[in-house]
Amino acid sequence: ESLGTEQRVVGRAAEVPGPEPGQQEQLVFGSGDAVELSCPPPGGGPMGPTVWVKDGTGLVPSERVLVGPQRLQVLNASHEDSGAYSCRQRLTQRVLCHFSVRVTDAPSSGDDEDGEDEAEDTGVDTGAPYWTRPERMDKKLLAVPAANTVRFRCPAAGNPTPSISWLKNGREFRGEHRIGGIKLRHQQWSLVMESVVPSDRGNYTCVVENKFGSIRQTYTLDVLERSPHRPILQAGLPANQTAVLGSDVEFHCKVYSDAQPHIQWLKHVEVNGSKVGPDGTPYVTVLKTAGANTTDKELEVLSLHNVTFEDAGEYTCLAGNSIGFSHHSAWLVVLPAEEELVEADEAGSVYAG
C-alpha cells in the first residue's frame, strides 16, 4: 500500500548529448520523465569500458536504471534522481562527460532543456507550479504521539504565483473541521495542527495551482496514542535491489515507534539445504543490531560493500519494542561484473536492466 503519493505527469524521454570533456551540462527534467544521458567517445574513437557515477557513487543497474557503455537511462525520474552524473573510463577513472541533473515536480515543457535552469535563476519561472524544496517533502508518512504539533509543508513557486489549498482524505479541509482549528500559513506553504488527536489521522493533500497547471502532494498522518504499540515500518522499505558484482548496495528501513525500538538487520540463509527450521521459522543470521551508541540514522541503513554472488538473497529489517515487533523484507539480485554487461551490450543488447 502506498503511504505517500505524488501525482506525476509522465513526460517524454529527452536524450541529451554529452558536453565536451571538462564542461558541465546543466539539465532539468520533469518528475516522471525518462532521463537519458549520452556520452559518445571523444573524436568518435573507441573509449573502452566505462562506468556511470552519481554523486561519487557507482550506479547500479536495475529495472529503472539502464546502463549502457555510452548511454544512461533513468526511467520515471523523481527528486532522488537529481544530482551530479558522470561517465568515466573504468580503468583511469577519467571523467568523459559530466552532467548536473535536476528533477522538478513540474513535467518538463518539451522545449530545449538548456538554459531552463538559468532562466529559473533569473527569476523567469516556468508557468506551471513546481516544488521549490522537494527534499523537504520526502517524509510522506508522519507518525507522531498524540498532543504533538504537526506541520505539513509544500513549498512551491510558479508564474503567476500559485494558490495552495488543503484536502483531508480527498475532501476540502478547513479549520472548523477539527477541535483546536488549523493554521494555514500561505507564505510558508504550510498547514499546522496543534495538539493532534487520533481523529486527525488520515491523508492530507496540498493542491498547488495556477492557470498553467496544478501539482499535489499527499502526506499520511498517524497519531500514536499513548497506549504503546509495536513499531511501524514505512511501506516499500527496504526495496528490492539489483547490483553489479563488486559494487556497493544500501538497504533502507524507516522505523516509527513511540517506545524505544530495537532494530535488527537479518539475512536469510539455508541450513543443510533448507530455508526453514523444524518449526517452520526461516533460518537467518544477524548482520547488524541496534546499539545505545548507534544512531537511528545508522540503523536505518544496511550497507553492503563489494557485493559477491553470496550476498544475493533475502534481507529483513526487523524492529521490536516492549509490545511486539514488525518486519519488512527485500531481495538483492547480484549481476555479473560490468565488463560482461558491456560485451553483451556491444553484441546488440542495449541495456542491462
Partner: antibody, heavy 126, light 107 residues
Framework: QVQLVQSGAEVKKPGASVKVSCKAS????????MHWVRQAPGQGLEWMGW????????NYAQKFQGRVTMTRDTSISTAYMELSSLRSEDTAVYYC???????????????????WGQGTLVTVSS | DIELTQPPSVSVAPGQTARISCSGD??????ASWYQQKPGQAPVLVIY???DRPSGIPERFSGSNSGNTATLTISGTQAEDEADYYC?????????FGGGTKLTVLG
Amino acid sequence: QVQLVQSGAEVKKPGASVKVSCKASGYTFTSYYMHWVRQAPGQGLEWMGWINPNSGGTNYAQKFQGRVTMTRDTSISTAYMELSSLRSEDTAVYYCARNMAYTNYQYVNMPHFDYWGQGTLVTVSS
Amino acid sequence: DIELTQPPSVSVAPGQTARISCSGDALGDKYASWYQQKPGQAPVLVIYDDSDRPSGIPERFSGSNSGNTATLTISGTQAEDEADYYCQSYDYFKLVFGGGTKLTVLG
C-alpha cells in the same frame, strides 16, 4: 519494565527431576527466545538450550540432550525447564535469560541476553 | 564446536585500564558479548555485538573483536567494577560462554 521472576530454591535427591519456572512480564512473551543457563558453585556459566515461546521449538546443548525439556505456557507468559535423572553435579543456580532474537526467525547466530532471571538454586543431595 | 578461553584472573589498580581477553577460533568472524557478574547476583550485559554498550552501562566499558580474540576494556577502572566477567559467542544455533575472568581492583 522487563522482569523475569523464577521459582524458589529446590532440594532434590539423585535420580529425581526438577522443574524450574520463569515468569516474564513487561514485554510480549512470545516475541523473544528464552534461554536457560546454569552455574555450579564457584564455576562459570554454562548454556543449556533455548525455547521459542511462539512456536514451542527447542534446541538443547549436546550435554543435556535426553535429560532436559523446555516448555512454555503462553497464557501465563511462563517458561519452564525440567531436568531429569539428577546427579550431584547438577547442583547449580539455574537462570532463565531473554535473548535478543525474535521468534519469527530461527537464528544461526543467536545474539546476546539482555535480561536475566534472579536465578533458582537447585541442590541435589542424598 | 567453538571454545572460548579467558584468563582466570586480571588485576588492576584503581583508575588504570583493565583488559580482559577472550580467544576462540576465528572469533573475529562472529559477534562477541560480555557479561559482568557480582557475587550472589545474576549476570548483567555490559557489551554486545563486539562493541555496543547497552543503555545504563558506563562509557568506560568498551569492546573490540578481531582475528581470534575479543577484548573487554575498562578504562579508569573503579572499585565497583570488581566482579567476574564472561565472554559469550555462538556456534551454529548454540551459545558458548568463556570460563570467566575474576577482575580484582587493587587497593
